[in-house]
Amino acid sequence: TLNSVLNSNAIKNLPPPLGGAAGHPGSAVSAAPGILYPGGNKYQTIDNYQPYPCAEDEECGTDEYCASPTRGGDAGVQICLACRKRRKRCMRHAMCCPGNYCKNGICVSSDQNHFRGEIEETITESFGNDHSTLDGYSRRTTLSSKMYHTKGQEGSVCLRSSDCASGLCCARHFWSKICKPVLKEGQVCTKHRRKGSHGLEIFQRCYCGEGLSCRIQKDHHQASNSSRLHTCQRH
């Protein structure tokens, strides 16, 4: 299903419906509002909630990818969508949840015998009458992947964190992305005011390691907003 890492019950597939009252079995209202929200809780019912727009997968969370909630040939606004679980359809690696990758249009597990290092993306296009059609997916773009047997070490080029060895994440470095160490307790981290703002960083830091969260350093509470120092701290 479309669950996200932010909340085991979170769904982020589509913008919110415009409606209010829930349509449910037994009611005459044929509507299903309160579904498919980017970010946060799966069943938010805030009518004016705005999905987070994005331009590329890297601007979204680790369990998200960036795409337009459209049929493919239409130019909708791209938003962060929840990753696809194993055995579900995909068109590129970033669509699959961590620990999986896209193979032959299906998210499959990145088992120990098939770790990915570098990734070759092949985009094939052919055009139909009024829309482009591609490799079994109408009006959509597909990609194929080349498999490698080792996970990226520190400094290796990567596409997403699952391409990197344990203890590393995939983060931007200049205009490419490389495997960098996951942050440890006490290390400086970047706290983004708006989800996805890390897309603008030239030198992107990894996230904090397990059991840690990026919070304002206690002795910096009095500092101005612009100079607040965030570090990885125990929950």
């Epitope: 415009l18 299903a32 459209t70 493919g72 130019a75 909708g76 579900k88 359809r89 995909c90 109408s138």
Partner: antibody
């Protein structure tokens, strides 16, 4: 709350064109994140998707009806319409308009808001 | 064209669990959606993307999808659950929406 309402003649003669309009209220038909579709249900039978339109005018039709179907949109009136030509008794059905949500890259397409439907009978 | 196969009818006693199946070639890789339709009413979405429920849909409604069969499960069935249930997928190869033939749930 978003509401969809079908309107049009309840009786159409064979070989003529069936014309229905769906008026959307409580939300804009021009949203880039939604599609608008037509589904029909012959009496006592199952649901059959007819086609879908995007506010930009992109259309998607079921293959079996493609040669006879035209779906159009009028964003200024917040309406979309269905035309089905050369109708026969087999086209007698309850016609529903609905809002469609789609993420083609993930092969997800479904309908979350429906009109109450309008019965169209094809008879001379 | 992708075909979805549903049993025409399923009967269950109140308080019991009803399971409505939807068969399709390798349907486990597809995202399956379920609608409930009561007589004289429009369909209502009860489960989307295999197992997710819209708000307002009771937790008694759940879905699963694996291999060649998707299943809508209704636990603690009530008289008000009596309705027709339709599964639906999107046939990406042909770019069109496909509905199953529908299953009539009868509460004994």
């Amino acid at each position: 709350q978003l509401q969809l309402q079908e309107s049009g003649p309840g009786l159409v003669k064979p070989s003529e064109t069936l014309s229905l309009t769906c008026t959307v209220s409580g939300g804009s038909i021009s949203s880039s994140n939604y599609y608008w579709g037509w589904i029909r249900q012959p009496p006592g039978k199952g649901l059959e998707w007819i086609g879908t339109i995007y506010y930009s005018g992109s259309t998607y039709y079921t293959p079996s009806l493609k040669s006879r179907v035209t779906i159009s949109v009028d964003t200024s009136k917040n309406q979309f319409s269905l035309k089905l030509s050369s109708v026969t008794a087999a086209d007698t059905a309850v016609y529903y308009c609905a809002r469609e949500r789609a993420i083609a890259v993930a092969a997800i397409v479904f309908f979350d808001y429906w009109g109450q439907g309008t019965l169209v009978t094809v008879s001379s | 064209s992708y075909v979805l196969t549903q049993p025409p009818s399923v009967s269950v006693a109140p308080g019991q669990t009803a399971r409505i199946t939807c068969g399709g070639n390798n349907i486990g890789s597809e995202s399956v959606h379920w609608y409930q339709q009561k007589p004289g009413q429009a369909p209502v979405l009860v489960v989307y993307d295999d197992s997710d429920r819209p708000s307002g849909i009771p937790e008694r409604f759940s879905g699963s999808n694996s291999g060649n069969t998707a299943t809508l499960t209704i636990s603690r069935v009530e008289a008000g659950d009596e309705a027709d249930y339709y599964c639906q997928v999107w046939d990406s190869s042909n770019d069109h929406v496909v509905f199953g033939g529908g299953t009539k749930l009868t509460v004994l």
